[in-house]
């Protein structure tokens, strides 16, 4: 084994280095001392470190470690944060487009149903966006509310436009009849299935991205234990006590220390791998009715078809509803 | 039959939309994100090695520090001696993760469970039933476009593409700026422009 170089007889080098770390403090001994009070940098002979210096080194070592960890995760963190923002904004734009498409369909095909239809469509798409953001709104309720609100307007404006104003109190009865008579056929059920599946997947996709950010933030801001601080100090700074300023830690030794310090963090690995692979599976399945872009941008067409379905059956429906809701004052149909 | 909404800008305004060279879909964006994420799949297991490679470590020097003394880089003492008489490294590992790490592991387990449930092939059985329920819909074929709804001539194929560039859409909202609460009503000729969401690399 090569003999260690003789320690700096005056501790001058150590002082000038330590001054950069802690300006103005007189903690460095003038000449090497026994260092019997040291707890981390246990000396084999005279040392240029004091207990105060050791404490400062420990603090610096833990700060270094935190900075290294943050720089390690910077690219990954940026990737997920940026994408979470882009997707959230894109989903809002899709909802906005879908609403505009649907409103435009009403304006061009059924102008007599506006502005009420605009209001119901607007409220439906507000709920859609809130659902994506994590609200506990039920998708089936949203769709039912849309069709429940639309039917009275369709009945009084399209199917029975000659209805006197005095008969307009039949709205509640019409809302009830809408479900019981399956006025829109299976279209509401179709929309429920498509919208709930696509929105569920979208919502979980966003939740997963946000959790990814949370995972990285958590490990980014970890406070390392005292034991870890001591190990890091021994590795990075104890050599300075012997005046060995230019010496670097051994690679294998560094790996052992890091594995010790990061034992807890490394436990995340298994679940992190699973997270990425599960997210990949989800993304691979986000097509057709599992793709909100696809489903929402096509809703106007399905709603249009559902109204055509009502119009096609208008004769039968008007007769049945006429009987059903004639006495709606006495008999609330719901 | 329903007009396709892109022909529907109110008052039949003719919109000159700049030609979009590159149309990026949300699904391609998602796949691109997954590919990038997969390059970080070993992020946590590789952290100790990453930190050692980004902090001062003896690479070309003959001598290196093992925590107690100067040793030759390839000697057995290079990894071992520095840990002696200090504290038990095994004990440090046995302590288990910090409470915050345990908490985040629980959250990961939960989201992984949710993600798996959503991706399960058996969760997709319903897809078939939709086509069999008889919505008077024609056969839409199996191409990339999704046929949604559709009775007779009302059937429309919706391209699965949301343009990220040069997006124009008619907006029927009252789009007033915050703080700007003067009387405002939707105008029939209002056209709102959607901004470029940009590319993330």
């Amino acid at each position: 084994q090569p003999p260690p170089p003789p320690p700096d007889a005056t501790c001058h080098q150590v002082r000038s280095f330590f001054q950069r770390l802690q300006p103005g403090l007189k903690w460095v001994p003038e000449t090497p001392v026994p260092g019997s009070d040291l707890q981390v940098c246990l000396p084999k002979g005279p040392t240029c470190c004091s207990r105060k210096m050791e404490e400062k080194y420990q603090l610096t070592a833990r700060l270094n470690m935190e900075q290294l960890l943050q720089s390690a995760s910077m690219e990954l963190k940026f990737l997920i944060i940026q994408n979470a923002a882009v997707f959230q904004e894109a989903f809002e734009i899709v909802v906005r487009h879908a609403k505009n498409y649907t409103n435009a369909m009403f304006k061009n095909n059924y102008p007599s149903l506006t502005p009420q239809a605009f209001e119901f469509v607007g409220e439906f798409f507000t709920d859609v966006s809130l659902y994506i953001l994590g609200s506990d709104i039920n998708v089936d309720d949203m769709v039912n509310e849309l069709f429940d609100s639309l039917f009275p307007v369709i009945y009084t404006q399209l199917m029975n436009p000659g209805l006197p104003d005095s008969a307009l109190d039949i709205n509640e009865c019409l809302r009830g009849a809408r479900r019981d008579l399956k006025v829109f056929g299976n279209f509401p059920k179709l929309i429920m299935t498509q919208v709930s599946k696509s929105l569920q997947v979208t919502r979980i996709f966003l939740q997963a991205l946000n959790l990814g950010i949370e995972v990285i933030n958590t490990t980014d801001h970890l406070k390392f234990s005292k034991d870890c601080g001591r190990m890091l100090t021994r590795m990075w700074y104890c050599s300075y006590c012997q005046g060995l300023m230019m010496v670097k830690p051994c690679g294998g030794y560094c790996n052992v220390v890091m594995q010790g310090c990061m034992a807890g963090v490394v436990e995340i690995d298994k679940y992190w791998r699973e997270y990425i692979l599960s997210l990949e599976e989800l993304v691979n399945g986000m097509y057709r009715i599992y793709d909100m872009e696809n489903v929402l941008l096509g809703l106007f067409s399905t709603i249009h078809d559902s109204i055509q379905y009502v119009q096609k059956n208008a004769g039968k429906l008007t007769t049945t509803i006429g009987k059903l809701c004639a006495h709606s004052q006495q008999r609330q149909y719901r | 039959s329903a007009y396709y909404p892109e022909d529907l800008f109110i008052d039949k305004k003719v919109l000159k939309v700049a030609h979009v060279e590159h149309e990026e879909t949300l699904s391609s964006r998602r796949r691109e994100l997954i590919q990038k994420l997969k390059s970080f799949i070993s992020f946590y297991s590789a952290l100790p090695g990453y930190i050692c490679s980004h902090s001062p470590v003896a690479e070309n020097d003959t001598l290196c520090w093992n925590g107690q003394e100067l040793v030759e880089r390839y000697s057995q003492k290079a990894a071992r001696n520095g840990m002696k008489n200090q504290f038990n490294l095994h004990e440090l590992k046995m302590k288990g993760p910090e409470p915050v790490v345990s908490q985040i592991i629980d959250k990961l387990k939960h989201i992984n469970q949710l993600l798996r449930t959503m991706s399960m092939p058996k969760g997709r059985v319903l897809d078939k039933n939709l086509d069999e329920e008889g919505f008077e819909s024609g056969d839409c074929g199996d191409d990339e476009d999704e046929c949604i709804g559709g009775s007779g001539d009302g059937m429309i194929k919706v391209k699965n593409q949301l343009r990220f560039l040069a997006e124009l859409a008619y907006d029927l909202d009252v789009d007033d700026a915050p703080g700007n609460s003067q009387q405002a009503t939707p105008k029939d000729n209002e056209i709102s422009t959607f901004h470029n969401l940009g590319n993330v690399h």
Epitope: K99, G122, T126, L133 | G179, N180
Partner: antibody, heavy 124, light 107 residues
Framework: EVQLVESGGGLVQPGGSLRLSCAAS????????RSWVRQAPGKGLEWVSA????????YYADSVKGRFTISRDNSQNTLYLQMNSLRAEDTAVYYC?????????????????WGRGTLVTVSS | EIVLTQSPATLSLSPGERATLSCRAS??????LAWYQQKPGQAPRLLIY???NRATGIPARFSGSGSGTDFTLTISSLEPEDFAVYYC?????????FGQGTKVEIK
């Protein structure tokens, strides 16, 4: 002048009820979703409830769900908050606020016009 | 729900000085964050929405920045009327939530 004016606050016993009103002027009332936001004495702001422009959709914070009911009368340009089963922790200044976006917005939940607030004190 | 943590709780500065207020979210809120100003006995006033857009009528000395989890409101040169409590609010996740506030007081 564009403004919102709240009224109906006061002292009420735990378990009691109160109805707050908010009169709007200077803008098209029915075009906008509206909210109630409260502020406990010396504390921060807490969103309580919202209603869409047409009144067809209502939203509540978990802390008030099942106890509070939001409603609006667009013909009177007035927003209401019916508060039942009141608790000591409901003590606050209640502000009526206009959501930044119109009815049917894609989740624009900022508040760009506020009233001066009305104080609700729940105490025995 | 998302928790917004504002710091510092109190900021003591003199008129003409620069004020930097911070708001940290418990998870990413993209850029869907607003800042409000509230003076004693008054209603809050919207200053900034979507992280960096000034609301109508708000002076240019107010600016917002940040995205994801960390946001900053900067008042470049404090005027006497700027001494107030400032709140951040997110609309990224349901329900909308506010921070606990930062009081900017005269030194």
């Amino acid at each position: 002048e564009v403004q919102l004016v709240e009224s109906g606050g006061g002292l009420v016993q735990p378990g009691g009820s109160l109805r707050l009103s908010c009169a709007a002027s200077g803008f098209t009332f029915s075009s906008y979703a509206r909210s109630w936001v409260r502020q406990a004495p010396g504390k921060g702001l807490e969103w309580v409830s919202a209603i869409s422009g047409g009144g067809g959709r209502t939203y509540y914070a978990d802390s008030v769900k099942g106890r509070f009911t939001i409603s609006r009368d667009n013909s009177q340009n007035t927003l209401y908050l019916q508060m039942n089963s009141l608790r000591a922790e409901d003590t606050a200044v209640y502000y009526c606020a206009k959501n930044y976006y119109g009815s049917g917005s894609a989740s624009y939940w900022y508040f760009d016009l506020w009233g001066r607030g009305t104080l609700v004190t729940v105490s025995s | 729900e998302i928790v917004l943590t504002q710091s510092p709780a109190t900021l003591s500065l003199s008129p003409g000085e620069r004020a930097t207020l911070s708001c940290r979210a418990s998870q990413s809120v993209s850029s869907y964050l607003a800042w409000y100003q509230q003076k004693p006995g008054q209603a809050p006033r919207l200053l900034i929405y979507d992280a960096s857009n000034r609301a109508t009528g708000i002076p240019a000395r107010f600016s917002g920045s940040g995205s994801g989890t960390d946001f900053t409101l900067t008042i470049s040169s404090l005027e006497p009327e700027d001494f107030a409590v400032y709140y951040c609010q997110q609309r990224s996740n349901w329900p909308p939530t506010f921070g606990q506030g930062t009081k900017v007081e005269i030194k």
